[in-house]
């Protein structure tokens, strides 16, 4: 698999995977006590035909061409966990594995 | 997790999973030996914002709201593979599971 | 820059009670644990339980439970240690320093900031 | 509750000496120890955290090591403005407990 990484100076059009630090404490979600803050990255960009698809799925859509079926767009085909630390609903304290919470690649899907 | 099945009557207009049966045949893709057709269905429909969200990290993006993000997008968020026997390169037959050829649920991401 | 000022020196009677403040400033106070610490005069230190402003979870020291209240005034970024039926071996300077996390592991955290500290006496 | 022995309770050391405090636990603490410097009439300060690890504008001249039960700060090189009350502490579990201190004197 195959994934373009960008920044904000980058002058790619093409979905690509951008830097995002998410911070909880700017947020206002002080019930995350640990990490305050951490690097979640994006995905931003176009998606023509073929370029960067993640499914042979995508490009079949594309060929039936059904009612209402968009072009694909530019999302993340990988991503990883964060170890968090965090208060629950009952107000206990939970370290737990987040999925799904780091963008590793991006794809058009 | 939940996702939306729809069908060519339906009137939503969020993200669903709608029917659509590709034909190889009618593709002229006369490599693939079997299955001549298959269900694969799409994906499609609107994405308001925590409506049907695979990940909190698309949440989060939201809030961030980095330059150049658009709102998530109605996208397979589970997938399964079919047997598929099919013509390689070097003209051998081959039968083996295609992984992400059928969407099973439709999300936001 | 992240600050913890505490309230002027103390004299209390035996039997009665005394409510010592740290306010917070340079940081957002809500999203991080307290902790009081105290100290007898020539003596070490002796940790005395924590708070989380965001919702008034506290653990403390079974060595004070029956007599230690925290809380927290998030309105004004302020927090509490109350100390009920003083006795003289409670004269001690009483710090509040706030819990910093390296880390997202229970323990993965250490004091990064001190209040200047606060002197109760208890005294007849 | 987790007891910590530190040793020497005091100790006199010239300008330039290498010193060490040694920090015993009663019980494994996972490397989770911190050490404090406190300066008479102040409010202690962070040195290391997690063992081994340098406080943020903390010189490295102090150095933390150990695991399991045993721990050490050592100071390489002596100067006028090291010399105060150092503390170990666990956060292994609560309560938190504290080393009773070492005092540093000037020889």
């Known amino acids: 698999d195959f994934g373009l990484d960008c920044d904000e100076h980058s002058t790619e059009s093409r979905c690509c995977r951008y830097p995002l630090t998410v911070d909880f404490e700017a947020f206002g979600w002080d019930w995350i006590i640990a990490p305050k803050r951490y690097k979640a990255n994006y995905c931003s960009g176009e998606c023509e035909f073929v370029f960067l698809q993640k499914y042979p799925h995508t490009h079949l859509v594309h060929q039936a061409n059904p009612r209402g079926s968009a072009g694909p767009c530019c999302t993340p085909t990988k991503m990883s966990p964060i170890n968090m630390l965090y208060f629950n609903g009952k107000e206990q304290i939970i370290y737990g594995k987040i999925p799904a919470m780091v963008v590793d690649r991006c794809g058009c899907s | 997790d939940f996702g939306l099945d729809c069908d060519e009557h339906s009137t939503e207009s969020r993200c669903c999973r709608y029917p659509l049966t590709v034909d190889f045949e009618a593709f002229g893709w006369d490599w693939i030996i079997a299955p001549k057709r298959y269900k694969a269905n799409y994906c499609s429909g609107e994405c308001e914002f925590v409506f049907l969200q695979k990940y909190p990290h698309t949440h989060l993006v939201h809030q961030a709201n980095p330059r150049g993000s658009a709102g998530p997008c109605c996208t397979p968020t589970k997938m399964s593979p079919i047997n598929m026997l099919y013509f390689n390169g070097k003209e051998q037959i081959i039968y083996g599971k295609i992984p992400a050829m059928v969407v099973d649920r439709c999300g936001c991401s | 820059q992240v600050q913890l000022v505490q309230s002027g020196a103390e004299v209390k009677k035996p039997g009665a009670s005394v409510k010592v403040s740290c306010k917070a400033s340079?940081?957002?106070?809500?999203?991080?644990?307290m902790h009081w610490v105290r100290q007898a005069p020539g003596q070490g230190l002796e940790w005395m339980g924590n708070?989380?402003?965001?919702?008034?979870?506290?653990n403390y020291n079974q060595r004070f439970k029956a007599r230690v209240t925290m809380t927290t005034d998030t309105s004004t970024s302020t927090a509490y240690m109350e100390l009920r039926s003083l006795r003289s071996d409670d004269t001690a300077v009483y710090y509040c320093a706030r819990r910093y996390y390296y880390d997202t592991g229970p323990a993965d955290w250490y004091f990064d900031v001190w209040g200047q500290g606060t002197l109760v006496t208890v005294s007849s | 509750d987790i007891q910590m022995t530190q040793s020497p309770s005091s100790l006199s050391a010239s300008v330039g000496d290498r010193v060490t405090i040694t920090c015993k636990a009663s019980q494994d603490i996972n490397s989770y120890l911190s050490w404090f410097q406190q300066k008479p009439g102040k409010a202690p300060k962070s040195l290391i955290y997690r063992a081994n690890r340098l406080v943020d504008g903390v010189p490295s001249k102090f150095s933390g090591s150990g695991s399991g039960t045993d721990y050490t700060l050592t100071i390489s090189s002596l100067q006028p403005e090291d010399f105060a009350t150092y503390y170990c502490?666990?956060?292994?579990?609560?309560?938190?407990?504290f080393g009773q201190g070492t005092k540093l004197e000037i020889k």
């Open positions: 502490l666990q956060s292994d579990e609560f309560p938190l407990t």
């Open positions: 340079g940081y957002s106070f809500t999203g991080y644990f």
């Open positions: 708070i989380y402003p965001y919702n008034g979870v506290s």
